[in-house]
């Protein structure tokens, strides 16, 4: 899964909008089997926060062992702590499960900083606040790890929701969601509403608060406002998409759109930040700095290292620009844009000194592995991972943090030519990007 700040926290050519409005295929998505508009039992089934990840409760084994599992659309293994660890309150005890089957195979997953390794097996898995089904799924029982589990995060494992191509040790290990769809009548689709609090939460507040919703098998219309706009999944490995244009406060960054997707652009709930390729990051920061130049920030702030603290209640949201990413649409030469606010890209951080400060870290960072649309982006939107139709949908989240003057937005259509040219073709010799 992508790294830096990656959870587990280890911390163009696109044409200008021409005012030409292309007709949408339909104004409303047709209702499909299993896609009813209400999934009450699944709403509010996530807890957590962007800096440490969002997790869902799952049960593993017989009798069921309850664990909190990080929801990660940037990886494809279901892996759980299976041995004592100082940061784990509980862990999967295979010896207590009558339905556990050992696959007699190990798995080793290194990251830039840290790693986990474990033993592969299968067991019965269900999601108490999910579909009323039990599936036999592959499980990596983590026996050793370094800088993987986070102290105080309250999750004990990771649910990789991406495709088999990036599963470890190889693509023959079926990911959980594939098993779920194969073994049940759950439609091949899930959607995520990640709700940033807009202020720092201490551990007890995280436990008591709602972090959002993972709707398995459908779309819940109460979780978003306006319309859902879809972008094609370019390739089924990560959830790869194509960005065709980037604007800061409506000003085009004017870069070759290939730069935005160099070497890929992915939607990843397991990454905290909006991560941008080096050239794009530098251009974006230059533009954001210029817009907010009335305040003197330390250099470390723009590197995500240094927090800044305004007197509580006086954060000058208005001096920070909105950021718009234009995504390839489903129709030829049509794009749409998603717009986030500083309330998304300035991440609230607890300042131990005093509750009378509002402290933030800059949550846009540099990447050497392409654009990563992490929690910073996802907290603005309801995101539909429509695997059946190979597309990802975005709508304004009903829980996004905003002020009285500006709101996150999903708008379109815009005419954008030659969008296919925005995609970067990774040379075939490339090994997995997991190590980058």
């Amino acid at each position: 899964t992508q790294h830096g700040i990656r959870l587990p926290l280890r911390s163009g050519l696109g044409g200008a909008p021409l005012g030409l409005r292309l007709p949408r295929e339909t104004d409303e998505e047709p209702e499909e089997p299993g896609r009813r508009g209400s999934f009450v039992e699944m709403v509010d089934n996530l807890r957590g926060k962007s800096g440490q990840g969002y997790y869902v409760e799952m049960t593993v084994g017989s009798p069921p062992q309850t664990l909190n599992i990080l929801v990660d659309t940037g990886s494809s293994n279901f892996a759980v702590g299976a041995a004592p660890h100082p940061f784990l309150h509980r862990y999967y005890q295979r010896q207590l499960s009558s339905t556990y089957r050992d696959l007699r195979k190990g798995v080793y997953v290194p990251y830039t900083q840290g790693k986990w390794e474990g033993e592969l097996g299968t067991d019965l898995v269900s999601i108490p606040h999910g579909p009323n089904v039990t599936v036999r799924a592959n499980i990596a029982a983590i026996t050793e790890s370094d800088k993987f589990f986070i102290n105080g995060s309250n999750w004990e494992g990771i649910l990789g929701l991406a495709y088999a191509e990036i599963a470890r040790p190889d693509d023959s290990l079926e990911p959980f969601f594939d098993s779920l769809v194969k073994q049940t009548h759950v439609p091949n689709l899930f959607s995520l509403q990640l709700c940033g609090a807009g202020f720092p939460l201490n551990q007890s507040e995280v436990l008591a608060s709602v972090g959002g919703s993972m709707i398995i098998g459908g779309i819940d219309h109460s979780l978003y406002t306006g319309s859902l706009w879809y972008t094609p999944i370019r390739r089924e490995w990560y959830y790869e998409v194509i960005i065709v244009r980037v604007e800061i406060n409506g000003q085009d960054l004017k870069m070759d759109c290939k730069e935005y997707n160099y070497d890929k652009s992915i939607v990843d709930s397991g990454t905290t930040n909006l991560r941008l390729p080096k050239k794009v990051f530098e251009a974006a920061v230059k533009s954001i700095k210029a817009a907010s130049s009335t305040e003197k920030f330390p250099d470390g702030f723009w590197l995500g290292e240094q927090l800044v603290c305004w007197q509580a209640g006086t954060t000058p949201w208005n001096i920070f620009p909105v950021i718009s990413l234009y995504l390839m649409g489903e129709v030829t030469n049509q794009s749409f844009r998603i717009t986030i606010l500083p309330q998304q890209y300035l991440r609230p951080v607890e300042d131990v000194a005093t509750s009378q400060d509002d402290c933030y870290k800059f949550a846009i960072s540099q990447s050497s592995t392409g654009t990563v649309m992490g929690a910073v982006i996802m907290e603005g939107f309801y995101v539909v991972f429509d695997r059946a139709r190979k597309r990802i949908g975005f709508a304004v989240s009903a829980c996004h943090v905003h002020d009285e003057f500006r709101t996150a937005a999903v708008e379109g259509p815009f005419v954008t030519l030659d969008m296919e040219d925005c995609g970067y073709n990774i040379p075939q010799t490339d090994e997995s990007t997991l190590m980058t």
Epitope: E295, K296, F297, P298, D299, G300, E305, Q306, V308, C309, W310, Q311, A312, G313, T314, V352, A353, T354, S355, Q356
Partner: antibody, heavy 119, light 107 residues
């Protein structure tokens, strides 16, 4: 131009109460917190705490909890420090300062108010 | 509490000299350090914040540097009006603390 002006020197007896005023001008008062710093003879500068001028909530350093109270008269752009039950060791110069916009550095200081406690 | 140590209580200099005042934090404070100048009978004046950012109106002969635990205030081309006490302060961690000061005097 930013100005921070404090009230004049005070001579008090042990057990009495003193109130120091600090009037700020030249900026939006409720945008910047006001901090209090003590400079006692022969001692380092001590951060006493600060008051959020937007919410009115005071924050005290551990050594200044109890007898010390920060307050505001927002409409007048004025902050106050009250010290109750004065002790000899409270003899010092008290400064009010505007806290920095992005952190607790202190960008504009009052001229200081000398408080002498003596029987 | 974080202790800010200014090991040199006094420093002697001459007009036109370059002088460096140092400050050491007892733990990592990032760049959350400010420097103040105080003349006798006056209140302190902010010179530098974020370890290296010059406050409005401060002459460019004053330069701050450092991060983590070691910080330096450098005055190049010392002027007679620079003879004063210099204090460092950390605002990384509650309670915010000051160094004991370094008095700059003429040789």
């Amino acid at each position: 131009e930013v100005h921070v002006k404090q009230s004049g020197p005070e001579l008090k007896k042990p057990g009495e109460t003193v109130t120091i005023s600090c009037k700020a001008s030249g900026y939006t008062f409720t945008t910047y917190g006001m901090t209090w710093v003590r400079q006692a003879p022969g001692k380092d500068l001590e951060w006493m705490g600060w008051i959020n001028t937007h919410s009115g909530v005071p924050i005290y350093a551990d050594d200044f909890k109890g007898r010390f109270a920060f307050s505001l008269e927002t409409s007048a752009g004025t902050a106050y420090l009250q010290i109750n039950n004065l002790k000899n060791e409270d003899t010092a110069t008290y400064f009010c300062t505007r806290r920095g916009r992005l952190g607790h550095y202190f960008d504009y200081w009052g001229q200081g108010t000398s408080v002498t406690v003596s029987s | 509490d974080i202790v800010m140590t200014q090991s040199q209580k006094f420093m002697s200099t001459s007009v036109g000299d370059r002088v460096s005042v140092t400050c050491k934090a007892s733990q990592n404070v990032g760049t959350n350090v400010a420097w103040y100048q105080q003349k006798p009978g006056q209140s302190p004046k902010l010179l530098i914040y974020w370890a290296s950012t010059r406050h409005t109106g401060v002459p460019d002969r004053f330069t701050g540097s450092g991060s983590g635990t070691d910080f330096t205030l450098t005055i190049s081309n010392v002027q007679s009006e620079d003879l004063a006490d210099y204090f460092c302060q950390q605002y990384s961690s509650y309670p915010y603390t000051f160094g004991g000061g370094t008095k700059l005097e003429l040789k």
